[in-house]
Amino acid sequence: TPEVWVQVQMEATELSSFTVHCGFLGPGSISLVTVSWGGPDGAGGTKLAVLHPELGTRQWAPARQARWETQSSISLALEDSGASSPFANTTFCCKFASFPEGSWESCGSLPPSSDPGLSAPPTPVPILRADLAGILGLSGVLLFGCGYLLHLLRRQKHRPTPRLQPSHTNSQALTAQAWAPSQASQAALHDPYATINTSFCPATLDTAHPNGWASLPTHAAHQPQGPAASASTPILARGSFVSVENGLYTQAGERPPHTGPGLTLFPDCRGPRAVEGRFGVR
């Protein structure tokens, strides 16, 4: 069954800034994400942001920036203007809708033990212990190294010192080691099956275009299920609506968002895909 996770973090740099991260774990395509605070949707919550995978984002104060992080996760930055931080005790909820299959919602809040100086990681104590262990380990290695050097110096006193030859093999080995990973990366880039982690390229298109077209972010949160939009839609008189095969509507007199069978509506960093665009009425 699909699940929704929510994580709330206090920013380390700005104590009045919070970030809500939400993600959807499960199959299916996401048609809308709603972020609220003070309770879930349908139980007295106040909307903060609404994110559509194709048409962009909308947000309300105190939300500062809502954006897609991946195809199935979002983040919302909040600016707390008040002197006393109301966000610290607030519940944030995220609802992922997949129309008409269903919707899933989950809530979360800032961990009560969060240090304002930290970004509230889920397990801060083990992280500190790891740092301490690292420092102690490094100290131990240095002490051991010093002792070993002293031991070598003592041995040098009792031995004649032979002439040292420069070691070419060592430098060659080092060069080869340094170059090999780079070569591997290059090969991976040319191999379509290589498992390299390429960066996701989310857009932050928050507004609709002045001519009435909604902004189209480059991160559709679903793979297309239906056919590409028909390219032969007629243009009618100004002010009327044109039904496109995929269920979106263009205002007549404007160019439809597709000009040929080979052109797709949502180009992004993962390559072309067909239009699904099933989420709106104009």
Partner: nanobody, 120 residues
Framework: EVQLVESGGGLVQPGGSLRLSCAAS????????MGWFRQAPGKGLEGVAH???????RYVESVKGRFTISQDHAKNSLYLQMNSLRAEDTAVYYC??????????????WGQGTMVTVSS
């Protein structure tokens, strides 16, 4: 819990009429739009009509002049009067409440749907 319950669907002959109703209950966000979507058998979802928060109705071209969307705020209900029905209007009709992106209404909540079959 937000609940949207559609009713009024059924079998009707071409040229006939039907009136769909949608009863909304439970707290909802101050959404921007309320409307109807439909899904014909084996086809994708299609927006039929919606009413913006400003009360202006909007229709898809294929239903203009035949369908009328209306609201009753007192009863917290939405209606779709469908006249001069055609075979291609056969679909499951969903009542939705949602948010506007430009002139689009993106569903945030919806009902279970009601089936409309136009056949002789």
């Amino acid at each position: 819990e937000v609940q949207l319950v559609e009713s009024g669907g059924g079998l009707v002959q071409p040229g006939g009429s039907l009136r769909l109703s949608c009863a909304a209950s439970g707290y909802t966000f101050s959404t921007d739009c309320m409307g109807w979507f439909r899904q014909a058998p084996g086809k994708g979802l299609e927006g039929v009509a919606h009413i913006d928060s400003d009360g202006i109705p909007r229709y898809v071209e294929s239903v203009k002049g035949r369908f009328t969307i209306s609201q009753d705020h007192a009863k917290n209900s939405l209606y779709l009067q469908m006249n001069s029905l055609r075979a291609e209007d056969t679909a499951v009709y969903y009542c939705v409440v949602g948010f506007k992106f430009g002139d689009y209404c993106a569903p945030n909540d919806w009902g279970q749907g009601t089936m409309v079959t136009v056949s002789s």
